[in-house]
């Protein structure tokens, strides 16, 4: 694969003239501080840019905001600061965009020293704004009801929960002493409350409440709550134990009406639980190790969220910074990448292709050599830089990138050796969802996926010099064209493209400095004149996902089915287009024992696919046995893996056993069983809105 423009990349030559005619520069003539961008709606071309400049003077901060609006994907911007009455907008709350294509926008004003606050709201994609006075000061960004964008929820700095049903015009206070609130499905709101001093003081003694009618009636659904979180169709709560300072996870699939204890280890005060990923089938749960180790264990749940299988040991998740590299590869189902902390304290990347069933190292790219971290120069792996590396201020401009509509493509910074290296990383690409990798670009880059994978763009990270070049590829990163988008380099801060990777436009943001001031500047490049032809049937080829051995008639079978996709040929230079829909054809596979997990009280011996009964129950298994619900203790030893669609083949049906007989213990009293089995549970969940960017569902 070439990283330079050469003979093999001759198709990309002469692009300059075509791109120059569709490169648009915009200079923001204001004091530069920070800039926030938000796309309003899907395919509307509307972008809002909020620039903020803040100066701390003694005890207060004075600042200035400017609001700009584009209707052409960032090619031109209009200064619309007058629409918000030149008010200073709180940049920490960002621009709150409504769900779906509602066209709704909320900006929260900074009204220093007042008992109330002000918001600016728009229902027409930011074309006009009206201001509304708030009877409270928001503690965090106002949240929309996912199913009705007129209904808003807010938590105040005095821990009051407020609701508006008319898009911010009128507000009613729902509850006092609220720590955390989250939207459930429909009109359901879950929230935790404290009784005595504060959220922090009452941690572990909070109550979990639910309203299903927007605050007309309330129900306590949990007590002794430490934290709560939502993931897929599961409601989780960590609940303090009666006997000590430990807590454990309880789960509900009926919005908190009934709870079951999860078969997971309990954790102490210094530990935490975190939902790494969840869907309607299952959940990935991280359980922190005791002590300040910086790692824990990943468990994967059954379809009830109750029984858990150990998935990965020594999973890196720092207690202090709350950083984990756990990444859902959205371009191929079942694929996740994360990091483990090995015994020698080096960090290694692991990948699973079957939703946490098995983890392996990433295959070494064929066009790369093993680095200094490798003991054997012929055998090593690719290690991916993600959130942890970024938090450690390594030269990693971007986290791994994948998009659901760019099937199989994963782009990431990495190094090739026995562990992650602190040396300057290169950029690697996989076109098959992480099975194989190739070095794509030398050195750190910012990158973006455009046109559903038909176009990749990248800009070299250059902290000390200005940037005036963008690289682009139409063949999934094999060949790169280079385009000089400006004569005068800019101090580059980032690439911006419309979420969803369907656009043909990309914006490069940065600033220019003169002796007296610096100002924001953006360049928007439209690649439509370079790639003019619309893709046709002949441009696509059939690709089997998860293919590892074409001679096996179970090839590609993951979670009981295989999928064939129509994918753009690398050699085709054409536009997928905004309306492109991924074409995939699933086929059911025959069942094998691999399609089943071991139910509670059973385990798989090393190198065996059969589930064997545990001779005795210890630790958290025993606790689950004592306090778990009756019906969860009757099993034939196997459960179909959540989301597995296999049919026929092996059916491991055997005698159903009641494991209740095994529930004996000196230190846990069985009489507590009944009060616990259906007892209420819950949790407060959320020191973790900082995890939004990382897609961590919930972290205590």
């Amino acid at each position: 694969r070439s990283t330079e423009q050469g003979e093999s990349c001759s198709g990309l030559l002469g692009a300059d003239a075509k791109l120059a005619g569709n490169t648009h520069q915009h200079i923001f003539n204001d004091l530069s501080g920070s800039v926030s961008l938000a796309w309003v709606g899907d395919g509307t071309g509307v972008i809002l840019a909020l620039t903020t400049f803040q100066v701390p003077i003694f005890m207060i901060t004075i600042g200035q905001s400017k609001l700009y609006r584009s209707e052409d994907y960032g090619k031109s911007f209009e200064d619309v600061t007058n629409l918000i009455n030149n008010t200073f907008i709180r940049s920490d709350f960002g621009i709150a965009i409504g769900p779906e294509n509602s066209g709704k926008v909320i900006l929260t004003a900074d009204v220093s020293g007042s008992h109330g606050s002000r918001i600016f709201v728009s229902s027409d994609f930011g074309k006009s704004f009206t201001h509304q006075e708030l009877p409270f000061v928001p503690l965090m960004q106002i949240t929309y009801n996912p199913e009705n964008s007129n209904v808003l929820l807010a938590l105040s700095n005095k821990n009051e929960l407020w609701l508006s049903e008319d898009f911010g015009t009128n507000w009613k206070k729902l509850y006092d002493a609220v720590c955390l609130a989250k939207w459930g499905s429909d009109n359901t709101i879950f929230f935790t409350t404290y009784a005595n001093g504060s959220c922090k003081a009452d941690l572990g003694a909070l109550e979990l409440w639910r309203t299903s009618d927007l605050g007309k009636s309330f129900k306590t659904i949990g007590v002794k709550i430490y934290s709560f979180g939502l993931g897929g169709r599961f409601l989780f709560a960590s609940v303090m134990a009666d006997k000590d300072t430990t807590r454990r996870i309880h789960v509900s699939t009926d919005q908190g009406d009934t709870w079951s204890m999860a078969q997971l280890p309990s954790v102490g005060q210094e530990q935490f639980y975190s939902i790494l990923a969840a869907n309607d089938d299952m959940v990935f749960m991280h359980v922190d190790e005791p002590g300040d180790t910086g790692f824990g264990t990943i468990f994967t749940s059954d379809d009830r969220g109750i029984v858990y299988s150990k998935s990965l040991d020594r999973h890196l998740y720092t207690t202090t910074g709350g950083e984990t590299d756990f990444t859902n590869v959205t371009s191929l189902r079942g694929v996740y990448i994360t990091s483990v902390l090995s015994e020698d304290n080096s960090i290694q990347t692991m990948i699973t292709f079957d939703q946490g069933g098995r983890w392996t190292h990433l295959r070494k790219p064929e066009n790369s050599e093993c680095d200094a971290t490798a003991k054997n120069k012929n055998e090593c792996s690719l290690h991916i830089h993600a959130s942890y590396s970024i938090s450690q201020k390594l030269n990693v401009p971007m986290a791994p990138l994948s998009e659901p509509n760019a099937v199989g493509i994963v782009i990431a910074h990495g190094s090739v050796g026995d562990a992650i290296s602190v040396m300057v990383p290169d950029v690697y690409i996989s076109d098959d969802g992480g099975y194989s990798w190739t070095k794509m670009l030398e050195g750190p880059h910012h990158y973006a996926i455009l046109d559903s994978g038909g176009l990749l763009v990248a800009v070299e990270q250059n902290a000390h010099q200005g940037v005036n070049q963008i690289k682009f590829s139409t063949d999934e990163g094999q060949c790169w064209g280079v385009y000089n988008f400006t004569k005068d380099p800019i101090f580059f801060t980032g690439l911006a493209s419309e979420p969803g990777a369907r656009s043909m436009n990309v914006s490069l943001w940065g600033y220019r400095s003169s002796l007296f001031h610096q100002y924001w500047i953006s360049f928007t490049i439209d690649f439509r004149d370079l790639i003019t032809r619309n893709c046709e049937e002949k441009d696509y080829t059939i690709w089997l996902a998860h293919s590892t051995d074409p001679e096996d008639y179970e090839d590609g079978c993951i979670l009981g089915y295989k999928e064939q996709f129509l994918r753009l040929r690398k050699s085709s230079v054409c536009q997928n287009g905004r309306d492109y829909v991924v074409t995939k054809q699933p086929s059911i596979c025959l069942c094998s024992l691999e399609d089943f997990l071991c139910d509670f009280g059973y385990y798989r011996p090393e190198n065996d696919s059969k589930c064997v009964e545990q001779p005795e129950l210890k630790g958290h298994d025993l606790e689950f046995c004592l306090y778990g619900r009756e019906e969860h203790l009757t099993t034939n030893g196997y459960r179909k893996i959540p989301g597995d669609k296999c049919q026929g083949g092996v059916n491991p049906v055997r005698e159903v056993k009641d494991l209740k007989k095994k529930c004996t213990s000196n230190f846990l009293s069985p009489e507590k069983q009944n009060s616990k089995s259906n007892g209420s549970a819950g949790g407060s969940g959320g020191l973790n809105d900082i995890f939004e960017a990382q897609k961590i569902e919930w972290h205590e």
Epitope: P550, D552, Y553, D555, K562, Q564, Q585, P586, S587, L590
Partner: antibody, heavy 120, light 107 residues
């Protein structure tokens, strides 16, 4: 020229045995999965058995399982089908077919076939 | 077992006419369906693989379409040499199966 040539067919009594061979030429035999497909007189095609390039995967139709054995010798560019406990319903033309190299690929090259008749 | 149902069983067609043969699978087989032509006293020959990909050397009048459970083989302008039996075949799941065949005769 890519070619597959079957041999070993003939008349055999019920309960008897027969070994079919298929000689391959014109391609790298050791890189392809190979198959046996049969066709009873005046009837359609029926898949019989499949063997992967290195013999790691071997598959049979239920109708022949336990009676037929597929094997190959990559050094000799040859595919075999050992047929035991033959029945009247095994009477057919037996074709040797190469499977393409893709996942779930088609049978892209076929031999001319060899006739097996099971009759008392 | 995946059952492939081909229709029609028999078709008598005038030269230059368009012929359409359908093949329906009892469950989804993705694109793993192939079409073969078998002339009298000859072995089968591959025409179309993966539902729509023409095999090398096959005349352009033969085309295939479909995915999932419904597939079609089209002969755009029938020629005399196209008189043969046509079979669909699925390779998605074991046991591998064939359709019952469609015999095309020239009027």
């Amino acid at each position: 020229e890519v070619q597959l040539v079957e041999s070993g067919g003939g008349l055999v009594k019920p309960g008897g045995s027969l070994r079919l061979s298929c000689a391959a030429s014109g391609f790298t035999f050791s890189s392809y999965s190979m198959n046996w497909v049969r066709q009873a007189p005046g009837k359609g095609l029926e898949w019989v058995s499949s063997i992967s390039s290195s013999s790691s995967y071997i598959y049979y139709a239920d109708s022949v399982k336990g009676r037929f054995t597929i094997s190959r010798d990559n050094a000799k560019n040859s595919l075999y089908l050992q047929m035991n406990s033959l029945r009247a319903e095994d009477t057919a033309v037996y074709y040797c077919a190469r499977r393409g190299s893709g996942s779930y690929d088609a049978f892209d090259i076929w031999g001319q076939g060899t006739m097996v008749t099971v009759s008392s | 077992e995946i059952v492939l149902t081909q229709s029609p069983d028999f078709q008598s067609v005038t030269p230059k006419e368009k012929v359409t043969i359908t093949c329906r699978a009892s469950q989804s087989i993705g694109y793993s369906l192939h079409w073969y032509q078998q002339k009298p006293d000859q072995s089968p020959k591959l025409l179309i693989k993966y539902a729509s990909q023409s095999f090398s050397g096959v005349p352009s009048r033969f085309s295939g379409s479909g995915s999932g459970t419904d597939f079609t083989l089209t002969i755009n302008s029938l020629e005399a040499e196209d008189a043969a039996a046509y079979y669909c075949h699925q390779s998605s799941s074991l046991p591998l199966t064939f359709g019952g065949g469609t015999k095309v005769e020239i009027k």
